[in-house]
Interface confidence: low
């Protein structure tokens, strides 16, 4: 098993650009989530999903969209990149 695969590793965007961060897991996990970590702060939940077709907002969903069409994939889309979205992003999955 590859576990959780997140791409790209690095990305530079101009303000206003949109992009998608891909996240896939091959462990048949139902729960998947996206977090952001800013300097000096802990992980903050952006969006999460408890199963295919089900998504919900976390603490900081502003400016992001997610979809969960399959159990394996949980892409995070930055709708219109802003300086405030400069961060390190983590995807996670669990049973």
């Amino acid at each position: 098993n590859a576990g959780v695969t997140q791409t790209p590793k690095f990305q530079v965007l101009k303000t206003g650009q949109s992009m998608t961060l891909q996240c896939a897991q091959d462990m048949n996990h139902e729960y998947m989530s996206w977090y952001r970590q800013d300097p000096g702060m802990g992980l903050r939940l952006i969006h999460y999903s408890v199963g295919a077709g089900i998504t919900d907002q976390g603490e900081v969903p502003n400016g992001y969209n997610v979809s969960r069409s399959t159990t394996e994939d949980f892409p995070l889309r930055l709708l219109s990149a802003a300086p405030s979205q400069t961060s390190v992003y983590f995807c996670a999955s669990s049973y």
Partner: antibody, heavy 119, light 107 residues
Framework: QVQLVQSGAEVKKPGSSVKVSCKAS????????IHWVRQAPGQGLEWMGE????????KYNEKFKGRVTITADTSTSTAYMELSSLRSEDTAVYYC????????????WGQGTTVTVSS | DIQMTQSPSFLSASVGDRVTITCKAS??????VVWHQQKPGKAPKALIY???HRYSGVPSRFSGSGSGTEFTLTISSLQPEDFATYFC?????????FGQGTKLEIK
């Protein structure tokens, strides 16, 4: 720091319209949502609608649909809320509020604009 | 629409008291609840978001908890500046809705 400064008090006649402005500063105007909420005298808070300047997306409370129009001028970082066909029960303090942490969490509030509808 | 019902509507307490305000949602809203404080003649101020997360600058005596349909705001030791009206707000679905408010008065 984030500031939302609203236009001054208005007195309007029944049947007329009012347009309230909300000028934002201290953050990137196109990045965060602007909401409009009203509070009638001695009453609770009532959400009217929201606007995302970054995309132009608008959502209205069905209760106000057809009577409320939310717009913005990104060049001046100003949002507007226009309410038409005013009646006495529209007498209230109207607030704009900005969402930073989440689409629909009202983090920052303007000082409020009192609108009085009276013949 | 999701109804948010707060209790009590009025609460008399003394400086130093521990007080708890409850908010019940008419349907499951997850943790998508915010607590606001409003002083007379002033705009509301957000205190707690996502049920239990304090905003920067909000004193630690304020805490929130709950998920699903029942939420609480607790002030561990009332200070004179805490006497105000408190509103809960759900952001699970549109239209966004608020509780009717709890007015916290000095006993």
């Amino acid at each position: 720091q984030v500031q939302l400064v609203q236009s001054g008090a208005e007195v309007k006649k029944p049947g007329s319209s009012v347009k309230v402005s909300c000028k934002a500063s201290g953050y990137s105007f196109t990045t965060y949502y602007i909401h409009w909420v009203r509070q009638a005298p001695g009453q609770g808070l009532e959400w009217m609608g929201e606007f995302f300047p970054g995309s132009g997306n608008i959502k209205y409370n069905e209760k106000f649909k057809g009577r409320v129009t939310i717009t913005a001028d990104t060049s001046t970082s100003t949002a507007y809320m226009e309410l038409s066909s005013l009646r006495s029960e529209d007498t209230a303090v109207y607030y704009c509020a900005g969402s930073y942490y989440s689409y629909d969490v009202l983090d920052y509030w303007g000082q409020g604009t009192t609108v009085t509808v009276s013949s | 629409d999701i109804q948010m019902t707060q209790s009590p509507s009025f609460l008399s307490a003394s400086v130093g008291d521990r007080v708890t305000i409850t908010c019940k949602a008419s349907q499951n809203v997850g943790i998508n609840v915010v607590w606001h404080q409003q002083k007379p003649g002033k705009a509301p101020k957000a205190l707690i978001y996502s049920s239990s997360h304090r905003y920067s600058g909000v004193p630690s005596r304020f805490s929130g908890s709950g998920s699903g349909t029942e939420f609480t705001l607790t002030i561990s030791s009332l200070q004179p500046e805490d006497f105000a009206t408190y509103f809960c707000q759900q952001f699970k679905s549109y239209p966004l809705t608020f509780g009717q408010g709890t007015k916290l008065e000095i006993k």
